[in-house]
């Protein structure tokens, strides 16, 4: 009978929303496959000391360190971390294993260090050592992919110089426009670095690692498509590679393609051609213009000409530094309570921006869409008609941009009242900002029509709650009104609201809402 290793150490990485964290089950249901930490007997150590592979954890990640003891019967255990003993509750599974777990929720610097686990089984004692550190994501990078021609082959290599090593995939689509959205059935993904099929309509390369995903589209001029109303523009930074693909389809092979920069033919070695027959026996030709590392003098109009198609051009602009061009002046909007409305920012940027929309200290995902004129647009519609300040923030490697929006929702005032021994105050958040009146209710004026003008102090927009203005009015108490009911009314173009207050003794006062439209 040959012996199996008694101790198995595993790491379970929990997804952030994982409800199974900290729960035990007969055969633990885990959010992701447990990673074997290869617990090995420590050489030159007295007794049975096992050492697990070092564990690197992202800040705020949740993990479970787990030890499986393949030994029959009961075990007892103790965790020690930074000289403190931690409670240890083994459970036993259906595979006859003792299972000991240490859950670390939302990893922080203070939770990094050496975790020692002492296990006593019916037969032997074991010591298991885990070393947990925080992954240094400061060294992480995710760079936009770029293209290179494969040596001696008509193929493109996609490169992303990122840390950790990214997964590179080609995203191909053969239809037009909207149907080439990421999750469309027309989109084909190939998880490889080299692409040989370069005739497709839309070709992108994406790289992804722990920091996210970055994509680069192969800039294409299609001579069979009607040219855009504005000249397509391609921005590049000095030193970056330039790739433009010119594509044309014709009934037979009797046509040729050429590239010119500012009416001068491109030099040999700066272009290569490929051709193929399509399913309906028409000929597809593509001609690539490329410069491995652009300089300022590569700026200009690149024109693709064909003996059988009208020529088309693109303006290539080489910049020293990235940019974000947009108007940053703040914008105020006033809408009705059920009116459909979206904030939008139109910008031109290179490299592509990362952006967020923020409201009330909460960030929302930001989508951007390219327009035909070289501009992009980002819209935000998810405001749920909450008035206040909305912020659009965009950045790329070289530039930052912030734009403020204020949203006002037209609605009739709602009044809240409070009173103290010396004064009564009313507050309202209606828009447009309301005006105030105070009225005294007495025997002479049972309908509270007697207006109070003395001792009234109005503060318009004195309190900003996430950009939402609040108006208030305060009435200083005088002997003339003590013991009476008073009514404060806020009114704007959409209606009036009132609140009645009894001015008698200090303390909280009951008040009756009295809505008048």
């Amino acid at each position: 009978n040959q012996d199996l290793p008694v101790i198995k150490c595993v790491l379970i990485n929990h997804k952030n929303n994982d409800s199974s964290v900290g729960k035990s089950s007969s055969y633990p249901m885990v959010s992701e496959s447990p990673e074997d930490l290869g617990c090995a007997l420590r050489p030159q150590s007295s007794g049975t000391v096992y050492e697990a592979a070092a564990v690197e954890v992202d800040v705020s990640a949740s993990i479970t360190l787990q030890v499986l003891v393949d030994a029959p019967g009961n075990i007892s255990c103790l965790w020690v971390f930074k000289h403190s003993s931690l409670n240890c509750q083994p459970h036993f599974d259906l595979q006859n294993r003792g299972v000991v777990s240490m859950v670390i929720l939302k990893m922080t610097e203070t939770q990094a260090g050496e975790y020692l686990l002492f296990i006593q089984s019916e037969a032997t004692n074991y010591t298991i050592l885990f070393t947990v550190s925080i992954r240094n994501t400061l060294l992480y990078t995710l760079r936009r992919p770029y293209f290179r021609k494969m040596e001696n082959q008509d193929a493109l290599v996609c490169i992303s110089e990122s840390v950790p090593e990214p997964i590179v995939e080609w995203v191909l689509c053969d239809s037009q426009g909207e149907s080439c959205k990421e999750e469309s059935p027309a989109v084909v993904k190939k998880e490889e670095k080299v692409l040989h099929e370069l005739f497709g309509t839309d070709i992108r390369c994406c790289a992804r690692n722990e920091l996210g995903r970055e994509c680069t589209r192969l800039f294409t001029i299609d001579l069979n498509q009607t040219p855009q109303t504005t000249l397509p523009q391609l921005f590049l930074k000095v030193g970056e590679p330039l790739w433009i693909r010119c594509k044309a389809v014709h009934v037979n092979h009797g046509f040729g393609l050429t590239w010119e920069l500012e009416n001068k033919a491109l030099e040999e070695g700066n272009y290569f051609e490929m051709s193929t027959y399509s399913t309906n026996r028409t000929m597809i030709r593509i001609l690539f213009a490329f410069v491995s590392s652009v300089a300022r003098n590569d700026t200009g109009y690149y024109t693709c000409s064909s003996s059988k198609h009208p020529s088309q051009s693109a303006l290539v602009t080489i910049v020293e530094k990235g940019f974000i061009n947009a108007t940053n002046s703040s914008e105020d909007y006033e809408i009705d309570q059920y009116e459909e409305f979206c904030f939008s920012v139109r910008f031109k940027a290179y490299p592509q921006i990362r952006c967020t929309w923020t409201f009330s200290r909460k960030s929302f995902p930001c989508e951007q869409k390219g327009l035909d004129n070289g501009y992009s647009i980002s819209k935000f519609c998810n405001h749920k008609h909450q008035p206040g300040e909305y912020i659009f923030h965009a950045e790329n490697d070289d530039a930052q941009f912030t734009k403020m929006f204020t949203l006002n929702i037209r609605r009739k005032p709602q009044v809240l009242a409070e009173a103290s021994a010396s004064q009564a105050s009313c507050f309202s958040d209606g828009y447009p900002l309301p005006s105030w009146t105070w009225k005294k209710c007495s025997d002479k004026s049972p309908n509270c029509t007697e207006e109070i003008t003395e001792g009234v102090w109005n503060r318009k927009a004195n309190r900003k709650v996430f950009g939402q203005w609040v108006s208030s009015s305060t009435l200083n108490m005088s002997e003339a009104i003590k013991g009476f009911l008073v009514k404060c009314c806020a009114y704007n173009s959409l209606g009036t609201s009132c609140e009645t207050i009894l001015l008698n003794s200090p303390g909280p006062f009951p008040f009756i809402q009295d809505n008048i439209s």
Epitope: Q2, D3, L4, S25, S26, Y27, P28, M29, V30, S33, P34, D70, P72, G73, N74, H91, F92, D93, L94, Q95, N96, R97, E122
Partner: antibody, heavy 118, light 109 residues
């Protein structure tokens, strides 16, 4: 000699109940997880239920969940399977098995036949 | 439908070598040990291999087991007529509990 001796099988009508027993000897029963495995006539093996040595972990196959209950009595070296709401598809030869190293079933009972038929 | 996939049958002449494959998933074979069982018709299953490649005492070294990723293999060399039986692979699944293959009938020609 290490062995598992089963009893309690028989013929039962659909909707009926039956309790299977498995008596262990020759090893420290209270230190090992145990399982029930069944085999329908002419078919393969199907794991039915399992229980850890201290009854702290219990598991069932989806096909029997809510109808079968596994239990053990370490003082009596015995494993049990209470089967309720029996169906025709529960007809099988039921084996009790000891769980050994690597989670393998290293000792098997002789099997007991359960026939569910009207 | 078994969680683990085995070929329904294999055959070889006496003295030959035969292999039986068993494929599963990352949550079954990928994360757990594989065991192999022999069942002669009319008898209870018998453990042949545990822990992917270990033999219990009394099991000859003609039998071997291996595991790679989410697949496992049982090998029998020097086939004998007494090896004719049904062979099952088994393991545990992180969410299903115990799981078996559908069984492979070994015929010695």
């Amino acid at each position: 000699e290490v062995q598992l001796v089963q009893s309690g099988g028989g013929l039962v009508q659909p909707g009926g109940s039956l309790r299977l027993s498995c008596a262990a000897s020759g090893f420290t029963f209270s230190s090992y997880a145990m399982s029930w495995v069944r085999q329908a006539p002419g078919k393969g093996l199907e794991w039915v239920s399992g229980i850890s040595w201290n009854s702290g972990s219990i598991g069932y196959a989806d096909s029997v969940k809510g109808r079968f209950t596994i239990s053990r009595d370490n003082a009596k070296n015995s494993l049990y399977l209470q089967m309720n709401s029996l169906r025709a598809e529960d007809t099988a030869l039921y084996y009790c098995a000891k769980v050994g190293g690597g989670g393998a079933f290293d000792i098997w009972g002789q099997g007991t036949m359960v026939t569910v038929s009207s | 439908q078994s969680v683990l996939t085995q070929p329904p049958s294999v055959s070889a002449a006496p003295g030959q070598k035969v292999t039986i494959s068993c494929s599963g998933s990352s949550s079954s074979i990928g994360d757990n040990y594989v065991s192999w069982y022999q069942q002669v018709p009319g008898t209870a299953p018998k453990l042949l291999i545990y822990g992917n490649n270990k033999r219990p005492s009394g099991i000859p070294d003609r039998l071997s087991g291996s595991k790679s990723g989410t697949s496992a293999t049982l090998g029998i060399t020097g086939l004998q007529t007494g090896d004719e039986a049904d062979y099952y692979c088994g393991t545990w699944d992180n969410s299903l509990g115990g799981v078996f293959g559908g069984g492979t009938k070994l015929t010695v020609l």
